[in-house]
C-alpha cells in the first residue's frame, strides 16, 4: 500500500530535493529558503531566485522551508521548573532543560516538569539519575521503597505491599504485642 501523501508532500515530491513547486504554476520549481529564513515571495520563474527573508527576533526556522512565516520561539515553562539551556536563534528554537541533579518527567510528548533526583537515603543507588528518569534506589534492611524513597518498616501497615519486605519487623512487632497480653 502506498502511504497517503498530503498536498504539500505531493507537490514537493515532483521537484528535486531542495526545491518546491510554485503554488500558482506547477511547471516551476523554486528553491527552498535556508534555515533561519522564510518565504517572502515565490520565485518568478525557472532558475530565478526565491525571495527569502531572515526571521525576526523571537522567531526561527530550523530547516530549509517554504513557510510564509517563521515559527515562534518556545518559552521555557518556569512553573514546571524548566530552565533555558540555550536561547532561541533565527535557525534554532529555545532549548529548555532542568537544573543539575534533576530529571524530566514528561506529562506529554513535549511538556515536561523538573524533579529533584532521589538521594536514596537509607538505601543505595541501584541506577543513577538520568535525564528522563529518577534514581532507582535499593533500600537497606528495615526499610521499604515508597514513591522512590526508603521508608522505615515501622511505617508499614499490613494492608500495604511493604508487608513482604518488612515481614520480619512486622512479625517482631506482632510478637511483642502478643507477649504483652498474658
Amino acid at each position: 500500500l502506498v502511504p497517503h501523501l498530503g498536498d504539500r508532500e505531493k507537490r514537493d515530491s515532483v521537484c528535486p530535493q531542495g526545491k518546491y513547486i510554485h503554488p500558482q504554476n506547477n511547471s516551476i520549481c523554486c528553491t527552498k529558503c535556508h534555515k533561519g529564513t522564510y518565504l517572502y515571495n515565490d520565485c518568478p520563474g525557472p532558475g530565478q531566485d526565491t525571495d527569502c527573508r531572515e526571521c525576526e527576533s523571537g522567531s526561527f526556522t530550523a530547516s530549509e522551508n517554504h513557510l510564509r512565516h517563521c515559527l515562534s520561539c518556545s518559552k521555557c515553562r518556569k512553573e514546571m521548573g524548566q530552565v533555558e539551556i540555550s536561547s532561541c536563534t533565527v535557525d534554532r528554537d529555545t532549548v529548555c532543560g532542568c537544573r543539575k541533579n534533576q530529571y524530566r518527567h514528561y506529562w506529554s510528548e513535549n511538556l515536561f516538569q523538573c524533579f529533584n533526583c532521589s538521594l536514596c537515603l537509607n538505601g543505595t543507588v541501584h541506577l543513577s539519575c538520568q535525564e528522563k528518569q529518577n534514581t532507582v534506589c535499593t533500600c537497606h534492611a528495615g526499610f521499604f521503597l515508597r514513591e522512590n524513597e526508603c521508608v522505615s518498616c515501622s511505617n508499614c501497615k499490613k494492608s500495604l505491599e511493604c508487608t513482604k519486605l518488612c515481614l520480619p519487623q512486622i512479625e517482631n512487632v506482632k510478637g511483642t504485642e502478643d507477649s504483652g497480653t498474658t
Partner: nanobody
Amino acid sequence: EVQLLESGGGLVQPGGSLRLSCAASGFTFSDYTMGWVRQAPGKGLEWVSLIDRPGNHTYYADSVKGRFTISRDNSKNTLYLQMNSLRAEDTAVYYCAKWGLNVEDFDYWGQGTLVTVSS
C-alpha cells in the same frame, strides 16, 4: 462514556479546609494522568494540580503550592484535592479533569463543584 463527578465543594471561612473528591468512570482510571482545574468568577481556566498514573509525580500552580495536596486511589477510581489554608482568591468552580494522551492539556472535564471562601 467518560464521566467525572466532583463533590466536596461548599462555603468555607478563610483559613479553613475542604477536601474535593472526583469519582471517575467510563475509562481505565489508572491509565491516565488526572488533575484539577479551576475557574474563578469572570476569569479563565487555571491549572491547579496534576498527578501522574501511579501518583509519584505531582504538579501544583504557584498560587496553591504548599496549601493544596492532590492524591488518587486507583483501586477506587477516585481523585482527591485536599485544600488547606483557603483564601478568598481560591473561590472558584473546581473541575476534575482527565489528561489527554496526545495533547498538552486535559481532554475531559467534570461538571465542577463550587468552592466559596468567605467570612
